[in-house]
């Protein structure tokens, strides 16, 4: 993927498609690789990632990686195509519009990934899944 | 084929309201930003506003001259884009394409125009 | 908002020639500046994304260049194709604004 400053568009002679035969244009995702983070114990949390870039490839997804150790919480969010692993897991839940976080097994630390497939998703990360109405107060977000 | 189709433009008196529809196919429309811009004869190209996806809540961001007036909805339903436009100004007289935001996809272009 | 200005309104050029069109921004923009060409009632067409990167299909002869506030759209060798309407524009915030176009007409 490229930098997130580097903002990729549409690629109209090289197109991809879906199973369904729609055309996959490259999506807005946030951004901003590993940072540390607040985000611990609530139903949901917000990226506060101020990168929004466009995915360099029309394949590739929005990605979340929430992980927790003894020392700090970090927020990683990128764009990433699903058909490689990342982390070494398969982004099982890539089609949904939704980031719902699901656990890894990681020794060391509790992991949760997610990944979704509509512009800018990961930035509201979802811990829980009956957490499943949006909340247009809490999902205001500022482009850049 | 990515496909945008804008309806809905036409002659409308100063005060009055109209509403635009952008028909979309061909792509995951409920997953897409979506933005209107418009351009007023013989003149440059003006961003109106866009909205973001229903999963992150259909929050919407508009340029400063039609704040408070324009408004924009979607149906991911029927895969269509509305621009509702009340108190229109003959400064609102333009043709209004719809894009999908920051990618390189734009309708044909409707225009409207704004005149007693 | 940030202000894009152009720069010139309109030029006049032949065939081959190498055409320069500048776009400078009221505020740090980074990269985020794209290069759109527009012909008469035809919808406006992506040519340079990120300041610099050649939009696929788009001729090799343009190329773009710039960071920050002052941004360069550059014809190597004007084509009678070229001939249209250019207008830089903003993604860095919303709302995501354009220049005021340029205008490249047969000398």
């Known amino acids: 993927t490229i930098p997130p400053h580097v903002q990729k568009s549409v690629n109209n002679d090289m197109i991809v498609t879906d199973n369904n035969g729609a055309v996959k244009f490259p999506q807005l995702c946030k951004f901003c690789d590993v940072r540390f983070s607040t985000c611990d114990n609530q139903k949901s949390c917000m990226s506060n990632c101020s990168i929004t870039s466009i995915c360099e490839k029309p394949q590739e997804v929005c990605v979340a990686v929430w992980r927790k150790n003894d020392e700090n919480i970090t927020l990683e969010t990128v764009c990433h195509d699903p058909k490689l692993p990342y982390h070494d897991f398969i982004l099982e839940d890539a089609a949904s519009p939704k980031c719902i976080m699901k656990e890894k097994k990681k020794p060391g630390e509790t992991f949760f990934m997610c990944s979704c497939s509509s512009d800018e998703c990961n930035d509201n990360i979802i811990f829980s899944e009956e957490y499943n109405t949006s909340n247009p107060d809490l999902l205001l977000v500022i482009f850049q | 084929q990515v496909q945008l189709v804008e309806s809905g433009g036409g002659l409308v008196e100063p005060g009055g309201s109209l509403r635009l529809s952008c028909a979309a196919s061909?792509?995951?429309?409920?997953?897409?930003?979506m933005s209107w811009v418009r351009q007023a004869p013989g003149k440059g190209l003006e961003w109106v506003g866009r909205?973001?996806?229903?999963?992150?809540?259909?929050?919407?961001d508009f340029a400063a001259p039609v704040k408070g007036r324009f408004t924009i909805s979607r149906d991911d339903s029927k895969n269509t884009l509305y621009l509702q436009m009340n108190s229109l100004k003959t400064e609102d007289t333009a043709v209004y394409y719809c894009?999908?935001?920051?990618?390189?996809?734009w309708g044909q272009g409707t225009l409207v125009t704004v005149s007693s | 908002d940030i202000q894009m200005t152009q720069s010139p309104s309109s030029l006049s050029a032949s065939v081959g020639d190498r055409v320069t069109i500048t776009c400078r921004a009221s505020?740090?923009?980074?990269?985020?500046l794209n290069w759109y060409q527009q012909k008469p009632g035809k919808a406006p067409k992506l040519l340079i994304y990120?300041?610099?990167s050649l939009q696929s299909g788009v001729p090799s002869r343009f190329s773009g260049s710039g960071s920050g506030t002052d941004f360069t759209l550059t014809i190597s060798s004007l084509q009678p194709e070229d001939f249209a309407t250019y207008y830089c524009?903003?993604?860095?915030?919303?709302?995501?604004?354009f220049g005021q176009g340029t205008k490249v007409e047969i000398k």
């Open positions: 990120a300041a610099s």
């Open positions: 505020q740090s923009i980074s990269s985020y």
């Open positions: 909205i973001k996806t229903t999963y992150s809540g259909g929050a919407t």
């Open positions: 061909g792509f995951q429309f409920s997953n897409a930003w």
């Open positions: 524009q903003q993604s860095y915030s919303t709302p995501p604004t």
């Open positions: 894009t999908l935001d920051l990618r390189d996809y």
